[in-house]
Each structure stands twice: as structure tokens, then as C-alpha cells.
């Protein structure tokens, strides 16, 4: 994760910084959230555990024509690492339960900030 | 109204431990986002950032004195208490908790601090 | 660590001046910048978080600016309450790190 780059600033990026510009994204998507994100899409929920982004984008990346969600997509790529396609879920172990992309984004925005306020980078 | 208060010894004896309380009202650390902090200042020196401890007990350190460092906290009595281990003259300092609200983007802006206590350290 | 470097030490100026207090970091802080007052006798202040964002109940004769690794803390017009000592401290990278501060005299 020591070569994350092109999210907010040319060349590498240190891993605490592509994890804050993560957080900061997804801060961004929860505040400014004024109809329904997404239009109510739904997505699997997933495992906050380990292979817990490249589970998220396989969860995310099936939801189209959401601008909204575009540069987490993006993002989550660039922790992820493997090429990740709509309708792939190898790392989406459990797929039993389905929620709106507003609450998976909060979800996952919680459970990212524990691991940065941890310093859990990788 | 949002208040700290640090307490402690004013003369510890190198080698000795140091034990600092901070005891704080007009919040709670059982409340999500919420987290204190312990910071010193040297005479004529800058502040020093020690110790950090979130609502979820989620501890940090500075590197450079987490051997030494364990901070706590008591929700019941709205206490968080800093030990610092082998006092040395050069950890002669003022002694400051503060607090830190993590909502949205995690700042580490300490928005409430204490007045300060004075630690003194000679044998 | 990241180290944080604020000039000037000290200043004086008139009452009603501008005021400009610098600080640089040695590498990128990405906004990540606080500022705060200490008056004599008094508990330290938070003045601004992230930048530019002012506490609430801060003046707005306070404001920050600055991106990267340059931050600005301005006072529009000098009062004779804003005599005290300012610093700024970083938040983007634990441990956290203080400027060695300003102090701000009333001619």
C-alpha cells in the first residue's frame, strides 16, 4: 500500500494518507447526501474484516450510473490487490443480506476510522 | 460548559512514576467521537503531545515515550489518568489534558484544555 | 515526525494592525493544521481547526489559510484582548506536533 497514488495528490502516497483521503471521501458522500444515495441501490453487506476492501469495491463496483459513489469506487481499487469486475465475489464471502449503499458507505466509514484512529494503515 | 482539570504531584524524585489525573466535566467518554489527550511543555520549550485515548479505549502513544507511557480511563468518575514511568529532571514540565471530538474528518484539534499542572522533577 | 516550524517568535504591533503568523511543516500536512491561543493566567484556546474552520465563539477577525506545507494564522485587526502567545500544531500524523509559538505584544 506504499504506492497508492492519484487520489488527492501526484506520486506515492503514504498509507495513513490514502486511508484519511478514503475517510474524507466517504465523509464527503455521508454529509452532502441530500435524495436517497445511489437512488436506493442496494448492495451485499460485507465482512469489516480482513479483505474488507476488496469485498467492498466487489460490493459497490455492481452499482452503476452513481457518480456519487465513482471516486470511492476508485478509491477502494487502489487498496484492493486485484482487478475487481462487476458481478466478481471472490472476496464476498457472504452474501446473505442486502443494504441500501447509504448505510453500507456509513458502515464502512465507521469501521475505517477505528482502523486509522488504531493506525492500522494496511 | 466544557471543563478540565489536571492534578498530580508538583515534586517527583527521578526514577520515580508520575502519575497524572485529569478529571473533566460537560462531556463524557462514553459518548462516540470523544477522546482526551495529555500534552506537556517544558520551561521554554514547545508542547509535547503524549498520550491519546478514545471513547472506545483506543489508545495512542507518542513513539518516543510509549515505553514509559499508560494512560486510562474511568468513565463512572470522568477521569483519565496518565502514568509516566522513570521520571527524569528533563521531564520538568507542565502537564496539560485536553479534549478532542473526532466527528467527520479526524482533526486532532483539541478544542478544551485544562489549566495545567506543574511537575517538578529533582531529587 | 513532522516538524513544525512558526515565525516570527514574537511581534509587536498597534492596535487595529494586521497581524500574519506563519508556520510551515516539514512535509505536506493536507489541511491538517490547528491554531490556538494562550492568554496569561488563562487556559489554552482552540482559535482554528483544519486550516480555516473557526472554533465556535472565536472572532471573526481570526481566520487561517494556507494548504501543503505553509499555514497562515491572520488577525484582521489587532485587539487588545488578542495580546497572548499563538501555536499551531499539526493533526495529520500521530505523534502530534506544536509550532514553538508566537508571542504578540500591543505597542
Known amino acids: 500500500l506504499t504506492c497508492l497514488g492519484g487520489f488527492a495528490s501526484p506520486g506515492p502516497v503514504p498509507p495513513s494518507t490514502a486511508l484519511r483521503e478514503l475517510i474524507e471521501e466517504l465523509v464527503n458522500i455521508t454529509q452532502n447526501q441530500k435524495a436517497p444515495l445511489c437512488n436506493g441501490s442496494m448492495v451485499w453487506s460485507i465482512n469489516l474484516t480482513a479483505g474488507m476492501y476488496c469485498a467492498a469495491l466487489e460490493s459497490l463496483i455492481n452499482v452503476s450510473g452513481c457518480s456519487a459513489i465513482e471516486k470511492t469506487q476508485r478509491m477502494l481499487s487502489g487498496f484492493c490487490p486485484h482487478k475487481v469486475s462487476a458481478g466478481q465475489f471472490s472476496s464476498l464471502h457472504v452474501r446473505d443480506t442486502k443494504i441500501e449503499v447509504a448505510q453500507f458507505v456509513k458502515d464502512l466509514l465507521l469501521h475505517l476510522k477505528k482502523l486509522f484512529r488504531e493506525g492500522q494503515f494496511n | 460548559e466544557v471543563t478540565l482539570k489536571e492534578s498530580g504531584p508538583v515534586l517527583v524524585k527521578p526514577t520515580e512514576t508520575l502519575t497524572l489525573t485529569c478529571t473533566f466535566s460537560g462531556f463524557s467518554l462514553s459518548t462516540s467521537d470523544m477522546g482526551v489527550d495529555w500534552i506537556r511543555q517544558p520551561p521554554g520549550k514547545a508542547l509535547e503531545w503524549l498520550a491519546h485515548i478514545w471513547w472506545d479505549d483506543v489508545k495512542r502513544y507518542n513513539p518516543a515515550l510509549k515505553s514509559r507511557l499508560t494512560i486510562s480511563k474511568d468513565t463512572s468518575k470522568s477521569q483519565v489518568v496518565l502514568t509516566m514511568t522513570n521520571m527524569d529532571p528533563v521531564d520538568t514540565a507542565t502537564y496539560y489534558c485536553a479534549r478532542t471530538v473526532s466527528s467527520g474528518y479526524i482533526y486532532y484539534a483539541m478544542d478544551y484544555w485544562g489549566q495545567g499542572t506543574t511537575v517538578t522533577v529533582s531529587s | 515526525d513532522i516538524q513544525m516550524t512558526q515565525t516570527p517568535s514574537s511581534l509587536s504591533a498597534s492596535v487595529g494592525d494586521r497581524v500574519t503568523i506563519s508556520c510551515r511543516a516539514s512535509?505536506?500536512?493536507?489541511?491538517?493544521l490547528n491554531w490556538y491561543q494562550r492568554k496569561p493566567g488563562k487556559v489554552v484556546k482552540l482559535l482554528i481547526f483544519?486550516?480555516?474552520k473557526l472554533h465556535s465563539g472565536v472572532p471573526s477577525r481570526f481566520s487561517g489559510s494556507g494548504s501543503g506545507t505553509d499555514y497562515t494564522l491572520t488577525i484582521s485587526s489587532l485587539q487588545p484582548e488578542d495580546v497572548a502567545t499563538y501555536f499551531c500544531?499539526?493533526?495529520?500524523?500521530?505523534?502530534?506536533?506544536f509550532g514553538g509559538g508566537t508571542k504578540v505584544e500591543i505597542k
Open positions: 500544531q499539526q493533526g495529520n500524523t500521530l505523534p502530534l506536533t
Open positions: 483544519y486550516t480555516s
Open positions: 512535509q505536506d500536512i493536507r489541511n491538517y
